[in-house]
């Protein structure tokens, strides 16, 4: 299993371990879900589900999620809250993850061009942490410059990747357009043709990044959409096989799947669509919208079911003097959201064939 190929078996993994994990996943045809965490509660829900499913997990903070982690009351001028929140989330996850006994990849999600100051802030924290501990704070980061020209997208990735490679850090990048909206990137009115990345585009990324380091993955568009955006674009995960074939032929390598690929915008996708992506080299699947809704359902149902016990601190159907503390204590009702979010992640771990891979 996964543990045999990792130097660090539990907690946040970095460097060669991240590469080995993704290589193992690609070879064994499973993918690791990446869960957007916005709080200690959502982080715990993901860690617990992964532990109970004997699976590795990726925890990621989006730009907005990181700002929320820091607190909505903090100004995000100059990306201040997003930087501080991402760093706070990273330290929190680093301190708690070993208690769950599973390998965890610590990642930052979509960073568009206008959010690069956030990326700079995280990278500075990585470099400071690297000086002290010999490894970066984060396992990996994502740059999403898919709104820019391919030339600018790739050259910006190259610039940052050189800094990251010095710390043996993983980079995820996006080329082609994922429909819908995600932090800083809105592609709801994109040309249909741009919603399918071409093999030549993917190879251009490989050609530019691979000489720097093999530690990168590509989020290529195959008709996928962020959130539950109901565009009229057909999902075609089998296109990913074309990317692998084209790059393999251009490089002249024997490896059947030279690319590490990422599945974005998976909400509403079928099991077979996920499996097709995974069979063609997808090693990471982003889960956000579905987890957000799952988290709500537990809290929603609790509030509806306990309505008569939470209308006042004292007094419920069992008597006017009966205390309601055990019903309104946040540890009780927030926990219900953790359970339902955890259940959704458990199901996804099965779908992505991640269960029992440790």
């Amino acid at each position: 299993g996964v543990e045999q190929i990792l130097k660090r078996k539990t907690g946040v993994i970095v460097g060669e371990d991240v590469h080995n994990l993704f290589t193992y996943a690609k070879e064994h045809k499973f993918a690791i879900p990446a869960i957007n965490v916005t709080s200690s509660s959502t982080a715990v829900a993901a860690l617990e589900a992964a532990r109970d499913s004997k699976s590795p997990i990726i925890l990621q903070t989006s730009n907005g999620g990181a700002a929320y982690f820091a607190g909505k009351g903090i100004s995000n001028e100059g990306q201040n809250a997003s930087i501080k929140g991402a760093i706070a989330a990273a330290h929190y996850i680093r301190s708690i993850a070993p208690a769950y006994g599973i390998p965890v990849v610590l990642h930052s999600d979509h960073c568009a061009k206008k959010l690069l100051p956030w990326f700079d802030g995280m990278l500075e924290a990585d470099e400071a942490y690297f000086k002290e501990h010999g490894e970066p704070l984060f396992s990996s980061h994502m740059l999403d410059l898919s709104e820019e020209t391919d030339e600018e997208n790739i050259s910006t990735c190259v610039k940052y990747f050189k800094r990251m490679a010095a710390m043996d850090q993983w980079l995820e990048m996006e080329i082609g357009i994922t429909g819908g909206e995600e932090d800083g990137v809105n592609n709801e009115n994109a040309d249909k043709e741009d919603l399918y990345t071409k093999p030549e585009q993917v190879y251009n990324v490989y050609k530019a990044l691979h000489p720097i380091s093999p530690n990168f993955s590509i989020a290529a568009a195959f008709g996928n959409c962020h959130g539950l955006y109901a565009g009229d674009i057909a999902l075609r995960p089998e296109i990913l096989a074309e990317h692998q074939k084209y790059t393999r032929e251009q490089v002249g390598c024997k490896e059947e799947k030279p690319l590490f690929l990422v599945f974005h915008g998976g909400s509403g996708s079928t099991v077979q669509e996920f499996h097709t992506g995974i069979d063609n080299g997808v090693v990471k699947v982003n889960l956000d919208t579905d987890c957000q809704y799952a988290y709500l359902t537990g809290i929603r149902d609790y509030v509806l079911n306990k309505k008569d016990y939470i209308m006042s601190p004292v007094g419920n159907p069992e008597g006017p003097e009966k205390p309601n503390k055990k019903f309104f204590d946040p540890r009780v009702w927030v926990r219900e959201g953790e359970k339902t979010m955890g259940a959704k992640i458990t199901k996804s771990l099965e779908t992505f064939r991640t269960t029992n891979t440790l």
């Epitope: 249909k192 008709g223 057909a234 296109i239 074309e242 063609n280």
Partner: nanobody, 119 residues
Framework: QVQLVESGGGVVQPGESLKLSCAAS????????MGWFRQAPGKEREFVAR????????FYADSVKGRFTISRDNAKNTVYLQMNSLKPEDTAVYYC????????????WGQGTQVTVSS
């Protein structure tokens, strides 16, 4: 726009095989995703299988997985559907379709070929 003409349909017994062909004319065939769909009497048209432009990637409906194989020959501008272990529920009109990547979904359709599986 690609023009598509299906052939190869017929009447077979359960358990037998049949191979459908779809001849395409038009320059965009070699860069299009090609697919097969079917429509049984009184039912909606349903997806069967599709194949990417070089043939590297394929995708099947659960109902035909392991029994049907889609393939293509770009030199002959033709896409095929090999159907094995046919069942009565496979009876339908089978349509060939093409999707140029600028379309976002299948945009060109053939006229269809009838497949009947009956003992």
């Amino acid at each position: 726009q690609v023009q598509l003409v299906e052939s190869g349909g017929g009447v077979v017994q359960p358990g037998e095989s049949l191979k459908l062909s779809c001849a395409a004319s038009g320059r965009t065939f070699s860069s299009a995703i090609m697919g097969w769909f079917r429509q049984a009497p009184g039912k909606e048209r349903e997806f069967v299988a599709r194949i990417t432009w070089s043939g590297a990637g394929v995708f099947y409906a659960d109902s035909v997985k392991g029994r049907f194989t889609i393939s293509r020959d770009n030199a002959k501008n033709t896409v095929y559907l090999q159907m094995n272990s046919l069942k009565p529920e496979d009876t339908a009109v089978y349509y060939c379709a093409a999707q140029a990547l600028s379309q976002g979904d299948f945009g060109s359709w053939g006229q269809g070929t009838q497949v009947t599986v009956s003992s």
